[in-house]
Amino acid sequence: KAMHVAQPAVVLANSRGTASFVCEYASPGKATEVRVTVLRQADSQVTEVCAATYMMGNELTFLDDSICTGTSSGNQVNLTIQGLRAMDTGLYICKVELMYPPPYYMGIGNGTQIYVIDPEPCPDSD
């Protein structure tokens, strides 16, 4: 009855500092309300990057000031994190919670290692 969450092991952010990955979960129940949270693990510290709650069949809505956007399709969530810099390289964990109806279930993925490379500054042209 445990909920399994799958996500890619590695993703490379693009030159604009945007990284996208899919978070897929095997639902043990028929949830109508789902919460998806992206966590960042650095050393042994875990911090929340962003979170969104959505009703099945509806779009994910992150807060206006969130660095995340996303879309959902069935038991799959497509997540995009923007504004990343080299210092943000790290392990990003997808947590899925089936909020309603009871019982509550939680699933945590193994994490996606996101590599971010800051773009080289353009050389001055004479």
Partner: antibody, heavy 118, light 108 residues
């Protein structure tokens, strides 16, 4: 520092009501699920109830369903447990606990004692 | 509901000895959602291990967790005087969140 402080315990007669509070500080309260866990004298830990994030979702143990109500005020960083129709078997130390980002209960209050006796 | 059983009920050991505590689940529990707590008399429980094997912040490395499926173990490699307490396992992957009955580690 991160802290949870319970209050509101005491001695109450069977059938009466009591409301417990748990004041949170040192973290972004609205970002965490919050639990009540109880421990009868000399016994083990029993999960009582949880309330998630904005307060719209709550889950209860069968032993308290229909009698206890969990709520939260995110503007006051406070968690509550309204206990109605109290029974002798509800006598316990009641702890509030934070549901950590990874799921386990990572921060606990010091507990407040509730005694139901005539 | 997932029922957790702990054994032994009491473990009598001396400081410096190794303690091995067992937690068995009535149905399979993902190792990601199994925790261990320590509780001393008159105190609140303290999180030791989450995800079956990850130490919580500030927990010394003499505490380690292992296991999967229905069988989990908490090991204290060398008991210190402050380790004599009651230990609870818990599953937190689904509601109702359940605790084991506890194992008391006392001084022989």
């Amino acid at each position: 520092q991160v802290q949870l402080v319970e209050s509101g315990g005491g001695v109450v007669q069977p059938g009466r009501s009591l409301r417990l509070s748990c004041a949170a500080s040192g973290f972004t309260f609205r970002s965490y699920g919050m639990h009540w866990v109880r421990q009868a004298p000399g016994k083990g830990l029993e999960w009582v109830a949880v309330i998630w994030y904005d307060g719209s979702n709550k889950h209860y143990a069968d032993s308290v369903k229909g009698r206890f109500t969990i709520s939260r005020d995110n503007s006051k960083n406070t968690l509550y447990l309204q206990m109605n129709s109290l029974r002798a078997e509800d006598t316990a130390v009641y702890y509030c606990a934070r549901n950590g980002l990874i799921g386990a209960f990572d921060i606990w209050g010091q507990g407040t004692m509730v005694t139901v006796s005539s | 509901e997932i029922v957790l059983t702990q054994s032994p009920g009491t473990l009598s050991l001396s400081p410096g000895e190794r303690a091995t505590l067992s937690c068995r689940a009535s149905q399979s529990v993902s190792s990601s959602y199994l925790a261990w707590y320590q509780q001393k008399p008159g105190q609140a429980p303290r999180l030791l291990i989450y995800g079956a094997s990850s130490r919580a912040t500030g927990i010394p490395d003499r505490f380690s967790g292992s296991g999967s499926g229905t069988d989990f173990t908490l090991t204290i490699s060398r008991l210190e005087p402050e380790d004599f307490a009651v230990y609870y396992c818990q599953q937190y992957g689904s509601s109702p969140f359940t605790f084991g009955p506890g194992t008391k580690v006392d001084i022989k």
